[in-house]
């Protein structure tokens, strides 16, 4: 999906008002210096691409974040404020076999959510030069 035509300001507002708090809640008890940010993004569409990938694609050691509150809110925000996103997801859902995943918070998931926090912060500061 191409995130170029999303309403970035509405997504930013959703992040600032609620998604950010859910990410902090998920990471509670973890030191902010515990993980190094290794995933970066260069502009808002790229940031949303990376955010979608890290939030919804299973990775080794972190099977699923999709049932977390921040993930539910992220998917809803993309569906509401990114034209055509819903259709791509409806088609993907119908094509995909159902797999039930247990919610397990592993260190790998914490690291992944730490990366997400960095991507969201970068999304909110699109005019900053890449380090």
């Amino acid at each position: 999906y191409d995130f170029t035509n999303c309403d970035f300001e509405k997504i930013k507002a959703a992040y600032l008002s609620t998604i950010s708090k859910d990410l902090i809640t998920y990471m509670s008890g973890t030191k902010s210096t515990e993980f190094n940010n290794t995933v970066s993004c260069s502009n808002r569409p790229h940031c949303l691409t990376e955010i979608q990938s890290l939030t919804f694609n299973p990775t080794a050691g972190c099977a699923s974040l999709a049932k977390e509150m921040f993930a539910m809110k992220t998917k809803a925000a993309l569906a509401i404020w990114c034209p055509g996103y819903s259709e791509t997801q409806i088609n993907a859902t119908q094509a995909m076999k159902k797999r039930r995943k247990r919610k397990v918070t592993t260190n790998k998931c914490l690291e992944q959510v730490s990366q997400l926090q960095g991507l969201w912060r970068r999304f909110n500061r699109p005019l900053l030069k890449q380090q």
């Epitope: 539910m72 569906a79 997801q89």
Partner: nanobody, 115 residues
Framework: EVQLVESGGGLVQPGGSLRLSCAAS????????MGWFRQAPGKEREFVSA???????YYADSVKGRFTISADNSKNTAYLQMNSLKPEDTAVYYC?????????WGQGTLVTVSS
């Protein structure tokens, strides 16, 4: 098995109001987010509103200020209060639930705004 059943649609004049209901079974309602999509004839399905268990809500620009989403956990029911309806609100309205949002779907309820 999760089932979502929408009701409350009908024919209403421009400027009128309707309240849609979505009764959910087969899930612990308060643990999930709920939302409403709509599909107008010949158009893509559009996500118009969502409500989350912490009370936060999202609205599409096209309905903000006119529609209000709410949920009653004790009744396992979500609502969409639609005020100041316009002809362009004519669509089949579907309720959906998080985390997936895109499955399962109910059968939908038709809202027609016409004079």
């Amino acid at each position: 098995e999760v089932q979502l059943v929408e009701s409350g649609g009908g024919l209403v004049q421009p400027g009128g109001s309707l309240r849609l209901s979505c009764a959910a079974s087969g899930l612990t309602f308060s643990r999930y987010a709920m939302g409403w999509f709509r599909q107008a004839p010949g158009k893509e399905r559009e996500f118009v509103s969502a409500i989350f268990s912490d009370g936060s809500t999202y609205y599409a620009d096209s309905v903000k200020g006119r529609f209000t989403i709410s949920a009653d956990n004790s009744k396992n029911t979500a609502y969409l209060q639609m005020n100041s309806l316009k002809p362009e609100d004519t669509a089949v309205y579907y309720c959906a639930r998080g985390p997936n949002w895109f499955d399962p779907w109910g059968q939908g309820t038709l809202v027609t705004v016409s004079s």
